[in-house]
Interface confidence: low
């Protein structure tokens, strides 16, 4: 997260760290007791490493009573996701068991109504991604509030030049932005999961390159079918 601040500890009980061989790789969001939603491209970086999900964490390194690392029983990338595009950049991870719920671990309701969030709406994005262009990685969860940007502006030739489909949304990126390591994390508007940070190699913090998020409402049928 660029230009953000440290999050209130455990105030985002849905927040997950998708880890490979014990290292944070991507963000994720608990959407059901045994399921974490993340970004499909995260798996590409996992190679053959052991994928696990950390829940109930604020600090990645410090012991915390609510922290627990879960093995992944099943990884289900969206069937249409491809390495060369950010389309359909969603991944569902089934935990080896149902998460133990409490004040620091709780699924987040996700948006099912397939309607764009009003431009200008302030949404919260959080993650353990880099906090500087130099690549400094935080130990504690960071967050930032970002205004949603209308798709027409986001699709301008000077911005993302038509790459933003109806199944994506954008948020402003003027110094405050999601960045590398935040991919798969939640964009939360009004207490509801609206978007998942896409995992392209986009430049961060440049207002001409808004943050791109996969709209979960566009994938309700797929999410339901996997969780069923």
């Amino acid at each position: 997260i660029l230009g953000g601040r440290e999050a209130e500890a455990h105030a985002r009980p849905y927040m997950a760290s998708v880890q490979v061989n014990g290292e944070h790789l991507c963000g994720g969001v608990l959407v059901a007791e045994q399921w974490v939603l993340s970004a499909a491209h995260c798996l590409e970086d996992a190679a053959d490493g052991k994928v696990q999900v950390l829940l109930g964490a604020h600090s990645l390194s410090q012991p915390e009573p609510s922290k627990r690392l879960y093995d992944v029983l099943r990884a289900v990338p969206h069937p249409d996701s491809r390495p060369d595009t950010i389309d359909h950049d969603l991944l569902l991870l089934q935990l080896s068991e149902k998460a133990t719920l409490g004040p620091a671990v709780r699924p987040l309701p996700w948006q099912r109504v397939d309607r764009d969030v009003e431009p200008g709406t302030l949404c919260d994005v959080a993650g353990w991604g880099i906090v500087s262009h130099a690549g400094r990685r935080p130990d504690r969860l960071q967050h930032v509030l970002l205004p949603v940007l209308d798709r027409a502006t986001c699709n301008r030739r000077t911005h993302h030049d038509g790459a933003i489909t109806q199944r994506m949304m954008c948020a402003e990126s003027n110094r405050r932005d999601s960045c590398k390591g935040d991919s798969g994390g939640p964009l939360v508007c009004g207490g509801v999961l609206e978007g998942v940070v896409t995992s392209g190699s986009r430049v961060c913090g440049n207002r001409k390159k808004p943050g791109i998020y996969t709209r979960v409402a566009s994938y309700a049928a797929w999410i339901d079918s996997v969780l069923a």
């Epitope: 985002r12 059901a32 987040l108 309701p109």
Partner: antibody
Framework: EVQLQQSGPELVKPGASVKISCKAS????????MNWVKQSPEKSLEWIGD????????TYNQNFKAKATLTVDKSSSTAYMHLKSLTSEDSAVYYC???????????????WGQGTLVTVSA | DIVMTQSHKFMSTSVGDRVSITCKAS??????VAWYQQKPGQSPKLLIF???TRHTGVPDRFTGSGSGTDYTLTISSVQAEDLALYYC?????????FGGGTKLEIK
Amino acid sequence: EVQLQQSGPELVKPGASVKISCKASGYSFTAYYMNWVKQSPEKSLEWIGDINPSTGGTTYNQNFKAKATLTVDKSSSTAYMHLKSLTSEDSAVYYCATTYYSGNSYVGFAYWGQGTLVTVSA
Amino acid sequence: DIVMTQSHKFMSTSVGDRVSITCKASQDVSTAVAWYQQKPGQSPKLLIFWASTRHTGVPDRFTGSGSGTDYTLTISSVQAEDLALYYCQQHYSTPWTFGGGTKLEIK
């Protein structure tokens, strides 16, 4: 204005089942968990369980796992609780109530239905 | 399960008095405590969460305090309309559990 409208009182015989409804309006139905709470003179308020209207995922109080089944119909923004194998101990007022989030942490039940009285009697 | 105990089933007070209703948790619940008011014939109403945060529209004569296992709801100047049942509830871990309730009676 948030409103939770519950179905009317039920008089049922021991061993029978009952299905209570709770119609939500005034907010995005899928945005908040729907909880069910039992109120009886003997045991005060007891949380039965909750359902995530987005996914249909449920969490039950173990004491009610064999008694209650929670479902939702998203198209009508209605939550349901099915109670089976009723006995006199199940006679109570049953409430639906939405979760309340502060900073995205669950912190209680903000909005309640008016309650449905279930009386189990031969 | 976490047990929430309200030791006083009834409390008697006069209009204008200050009254404190207590609640004890069977384990440390880290201020994850809510308070509800239930008037006769009505549904419960959320007053306080996180032990001390007033819910929207709740008069400031209602204050919550406490930490660890011990929590208190205080009404600084009791009004006639405060005649009701008051319940504490832990929102620390599932299953969410309530106290047995304290009935506030006006002398």
